[in-house]
């Protein structure tokens, strides 16, 4: 399988992570989507989900987090807006192609959010105070429960298999944008032999 | 290995057919968007159109320059593109290329070898 | 329909010297972060080969003498050294929007 690697971004408090999950294959358009967070010796926990079937350009919220899927380019776009220290941890995007395991997206990234807010270059020093403008179009997805019969035994956990209910919704702020691409993880090309070897390269982050 | 093999070109007249083909191997067909591209002689690339996937309704689009003369479907059961062509015009002459995308809008990593179509009377 | 426009024309180069081939789009091809701009290497009688894609990405088996960048309109492509065997034409191309346009070509030849 496809070697899962993490990218640490170092944050502050106040600031955005904005992620582009890149699914890029179109039968993944219109599956449910999900950003995880991953605990140490714990399975992954949905924070967020888009709808089922997602859909295009259509905000979702969860709390701060916000998911738009956007099919006619094969990304889907996660913010998490005024980051806290405690949002510091290992997250991912996946894909829910129930009764199969939820197909990974990688890079994951390791989030360390500090204290104190400085601004990043090409970041706007003054949008501390900003108040974030969700669109009115936003809607909360309700996320699925997924068990797995797999056995976690790496550590970090790399199971995609078991997610849960959103358990916190927090106040939003905005600041400034980290901007990151995610790829497609071809768990799916081994499992369904729908990809030839010759293309798996091609989705990986070079 | 990934392999798009052309075919079906050929002379025709002005005002005439042709359906081109493209066989594909070495992936898995149904799950990509397939494109023709044409290039006249000593001239540029030129975009022709693209067939989606079946997730996307087999949904087609094309150049100005061909819209409503030309034709792309698709056979997954026999992993083959094709190309219809009507209503032929002389500066439809060109090296008639099949090509695969990485994904949705994304780039094209595997050509074929092309084939010729010439419109003369 | 998003233009492409490729300067120059041709170009002549020194081998071992570097060359520069920019791209300029009517309007965006970008959708958030990522620029859906890519660039192709043509030899006579064959087709075109895919060297970078996405602007800056350098598609596996390329040499890393090839590199791009820009981002929303303007673009490069840059060879850092030239080789022989880069003499070809060039060509952009996008895939932000449809129709999926290419650029007019750019001819590279040794000085």
């Known amino acids: 399988a496809t070697k899962l690697t993490e990218e640490k971004y170092e944050l502050k408090e106040g600031q955005t992570l904005d992620v582009k999950c890149d699914y890029t294959l179109e039968k993944f358009a219109a599956s449910q989507k999900a950003w995880q967070i991953i605990r140490d010796g714990e399975m992954p926990k949905t924070l967020a989900c888009t709808e089922r079937p997602s859909k295009n350009s259509h905000p979702v919220q969860v709390g701060r987090i916000i998911l738009e899927d956007y099919h006619d380019h094969g990304l889907l776009r996660v913010r998490m807006v005024n980051l806290q220290v405690e949002d510091s941890g290992l997250y991912q995007c996946v894909i829910y192609q129930p009764p199969k395991e939820p197909h990974m997206l990688f890079d994951r990234i390791r989030l360390v959010v500090t204290k104190g807010f400085s601004g990043t270059p090409g970041s706007n020093e003054n949008s501390t105070q900003n108040v974030y403008k969700i669109p009115p179009t936003t809607t909360k997805a309700l996320c699925p429960l997924y068990t797995s019969p797999r056995t976690v035994t790496q550590a970090p956990p790399k199971s995609t298999a078991d997610v849960s209910t959103p358990d916190s919704e927090i106040n939003l702020t905005n600041v400034t944008d980290i901007i990151r691409e995610q790829k497609l993880i071809s768990e799916e090309d081994l499992e369904q032999k729908l990809i030839s070897e010759e293309d798996l390269h091609h989705h990986h982050h070079h | 290995e990934v392999q798009l093999v052309e075919s079906g070109g050929g002379l025709v007249q002005p005002g005439g057919s042709l359906k081109l083909s493209c066989a594909a191997s070495?992936?898995?067909?149904?799950?990509?968007?397939m494109h023709w591209v044409r290039q006249a002689s000593g001239k540029g690339l030129e975009w022709v159109g693209r067939i989606r996937t079946k997730s996307s309704n087999y949904a087609t689009y094309y150049a100005a320059s061909v819209k409503g003369r030309f034709t792309i479907s698709r056979d997954d059961s026999k992993n083959t593109a094709y190309l219809q062509m009507n209503s032929l015009k002389t500066e439809d002459t060109a090296v008639y290329y099949c090509?695969?995308?990485?994904?949705?809008?994304?780039?094209?990593?595997?050509w074929g070898q092309g084939t010729l179509v010439t419109v003369s009377s | 329909d998003i233009v492409l426009t490729q300067s120059p024309d041709s170009l002549a180069v020194s081998l071992g010297e570097r060359a520069t081939i920019n791209c300029r789009a009517s309007?965006?091809?970008?959708?958030?972060?990522?620029?859906?701009l890519h660039w192709y290497q043509q030899k006579p009688g064959q087709p075109p080969k895919l060297l970078i894609y996405r602007a800056s990405n350098l598609e596996s088996g390329v040499p890393d003498r090839f590199s791009g960048s820009g981002s929303g309109t303007d673009f490069t492509l840059t060879i850092s050294s030239l080789q022989a065997e880069d003499v070809a034409v060039y060509y952009c191309?996008?895939?932000?929007?449809?129709?999926?346009?290419f650029g007019q070509g750019t001819k590279l030849e040794i000085k």
């Open positions: 309007e965006s091809v970008d959708t958030f972060d990522y620029s859906f």
């Open positions: 090509t695969r995308d990485m994904g949705i809008r994304r780039q094209f990593a595997y």
């Open positions: 070495g992936f898995t067909f149904s799950t990509y968007a």
């Open positions: 191309q996008q895939s932000n929007e449809d129709p999926y346009t």
